[in-house]
Amino acid sequence: EPPTACREKQYLINSQCCSLCQPGQKLVSDCTEFTETECLPCDSGEFSAQWNREIRCHQHRHCEPNQGLRVKKEGTAESDTVCTCEEGWHCTSEACESCVLHRSCSPGFGVKQIATGVSDTICEPCPVGFFSNVSSAFEKCHPWTSCETKDLVVQQAGTNKTDVVCGPQDRLR
């Protein structure tokens, strides 16, 4: 009986199991019972990532600079080009189709994790004893100044957005 299913890395055509083309190649002609599957390497600028029976390879992705993209890893005959974002930007998705500017942490918030090419800035509220008075994509919350270590006293309490104000101790006692 002719086969109804084929082994791994084969495909069924005309009641026959033919070898798939390996990654980095494309199909030229199906096998016969007298000759094997005919495959050719992908052209420059193209790739095929899997064992396949495609008559065309896929075009390598173009990392569009106008969208803030740049090449992270050049494509090969077996893999697509990997894009990432320019400095100060990050990908909007895992596929990195486009980039957006890293968010800044507002006053009262500090940077918990600095953004990368694929992830945005992570901000956290400044806890008691810490403050941030700038909008920044890099600055962490800073601890309030310790007046005591400077032989000073707190004249104005700090907030999550402002540092304490220190002043001299009251000598009239």
Epitope: P2, N14, S15, Q16, S29, T32, E33, F34, T35, E36, E38
Partner: antibody, heavy 117, light 107 residues
Amino acid sequence: EVQLLESGGGLVQPGGSLRLSCAASGFTFSSYAMSWVRQAPGKGLEWVSGIGSYGGGTYYADSVKGRFTISRDNSKNTLYLQMNSLRAEDTAVYYCARYVNFGMDYWGQGTLVTVSS
Amino acid sequence: DIQMTQSPSSLSASVGDRVTITCRASQSISSYLNWYQQKPGKAPKLLIYAASSLQSGVPSRFSGSGSGTDFTLTISSLQPEDFATYYCQQYGRNPPTFGQGTKLEIK
């Protein structure tokens, strides 16, 4: 025991026709692709034509395309090669062979075709 | 069509010798190559398939290697019955094609 027995060869004039037969025994004929290979006197081997199993496709060398026709009768366990418009350069011993995994594992003893006036 | 070129066309050797026959394809055929042996007045016999696999019943002194465009058939220790003509045959592209043959003679 696998056996392949060719017949039908002989002397024929240029432009004439001949039909070769190959009687198969000792295996399930319909399950195998079959082919014809020829060898001109004192020369090397030339693949002429092939026919797939289960009524599969037919394939020809460029040198015989349009002149030769391969066929099979699975009920008679027989392979055929109809040769028309014969030329002097078709003179050769014609072998039938069984195909398995892209190789010819069993061959007949051959039949001589001579094209001459 | 793919051209198959064997070398040498003929060679003389003695019983016990190690012999290598080469076959070159005009374009890459992966490992899609067979080797056949033919004795005078007889039909060819399949020795090696898929470049390096030994056909059932063939003595282990025969071996094949190679891929792409360059292939070799090696007989590790010649026996009297090995003197014959050897052909390579590709099945990477339609139609299948043979090399011109290598005649192995007794020295």
